[in-house]
């Protein structure tokens, strides 16, 4: 069964730096990855980055760098410039468009009492949507 996993990590050395890691588990090839925050893409979420395996990546502030980790996983580095640390309570969502499976999405966030370097579990009920 296709599945999307999401991790949110806080840098141990720089508490203003966060990284969102996400990946697609399942057959098929990835045609597009969209990372958003504040909710799922197209459902109240704001795009942070779009990654295409051949056309490259595009990102929007506060995203700093979007990169492929493997052919089915990506990482997105974020710079939290605000003193109030808005990332701490934010939901990050990753949507993978895959052929022939369709689109699958899951969300995760950093726990409120997160230690530096800690990864967040996915939200209790990931949004797994096959379009």
């Amino acid at each position: 069964t296709p599945e999307v996993w999401v991790q949110v990590q806080m840098e141990a050395t720089e508490l203003s730096s966060f990284t969102v890691h996400c990946g697609f588990l399942g057959p098929g090839s990835i045609s597009l990855v969209t990372v958003s925050w504040g909710g799922p893409d197209g459902a109240g979420g704001t795009k942070l980055a779009v990654l295409h395996p051949e056309l490259g990546t595009r990102q929007w502030a506060p995203a700093r760098q979007a990169r492929w980790e493997t052919q089915s996983s990506i990482s997105l580095a974020l710079e939290d410039s605000g003193a109030s640390s808005p990332f701490a309570n934010t939901t990050f969502c990753c949507k993978f468009a895959s052929f022939p499976e369709g689109s699958w999405e899951s969300c995760g966030s950093l726990p409120p009492s997160s230690d530096p370097g800690l990864s967040a579990p996915p939200t209790p009920v990931p949004i797994l949507r096959a379009d």
Epitope: E3, W5, Q7, Q9, H21, C22, G23, L25, Q65, R67, W68, E69, T70, Q71, S72, S73, I74, S75, G117, L118, S119, A120, P121, P122
Partner: antibody
């Protein structure tokens, strides 16, 4: 088929540096991460670091100050360099492929046995 | 670093038995748990990733389960070729860490 081959010295003098090359075949480094792990009787399995397909690296904080991982994608090679080795760095050093981003290492090199001794 | 504990360092079982190997983590790792097999003088072999996903080519008698801080690897019908040492490993937070291993032997 997927293969990871390793080359490097078996014996290293204390305070000297270690260089190991992992040459892969059967897949491209443009789609996979390569981890480095070492294993010794005293310390068990220790993850050293990874270089992802995009070139970004992550290191175990315990080794970050003396560890460097790089690659030459065109030659299908990944390089581990570790400085200032001591006796307790004696171990088997292995490279291992990551296809999911989950640090799940699905194919491993044979390992390079490194002894630090004068 | 996150601690991985395999409380049973060695385990004896008979061929055909159902064998369960346990792994406990020092904090919730949200299913980011992998299992490996290692035979003497050989490299590690990935069996299970993300708690329960079977790696390609691994026999279906191997299965993984668990959540939170408690995870297990089950071999449903032990065969001679399964005699090896089994390691759990978390990929939840840096650095990824391994358990100390459980050596499986024939009774």
């Amino acid at each position: 088929q997927v293969q990871l081959k390793q080359s490097g010295p078996g014996l290293v003098q204390p305070s000297q540096n270690l260089s190991i090359t992992c040459t892969v075949s059967g897949f491209s480094l443009t789609g996979y991460g390569i981890n480095w792990v070492r294993q010794s009787p005293g310390k068990g399995l220790e993850w050293l670091g990874v270089i992802w397909s995009g070139g970004n690296t992550e290191y175990n904080a315990a080794f970050r100050s003396r560890l460097s991982i790089s690659k030459d994608t065109s030659k299908s090679q990944v390089f581990l360099k570790m400085n200032s080795l001591q006796a307790d760095d004696t171990a088997i050093y292995s490279c291992a492929r990551d296809s999911t981003g989950l640090y799940a290492m699905d194919y491993w090199g044979p390992g390079t046995s490194v002894t630090v001794s004068s | 670093d996150l601690q991985m504990t395999q409380t049973t360092s060695s385990l004896s079982a008979s061929l055909g038995d159902r064998v369960t190997i346990s792994c406990r983590t020092s904090q919730d790792i949200s299913n980011f748990l992998n299992w490996y097999q290692q035979k003497p003088d050989g490299p590690l072999k990935l069996l299970i990733y993300y708690t329960s996903r079977l790696h390609s080519g691994v026999p279906s008698r191997f299965s993984g389960s668990g959540s939170g801080t408690d995870y297990s690897l089950t071999i449903s019908n032990l065969e001679q070729e399964d005699i090896a040492t089994y390691f759990c490993q978390q990929g939840y937070m840096l650095p990824p860490t391994f358990g100390g291993g459980t050596k499986l032997e024939i009774k």
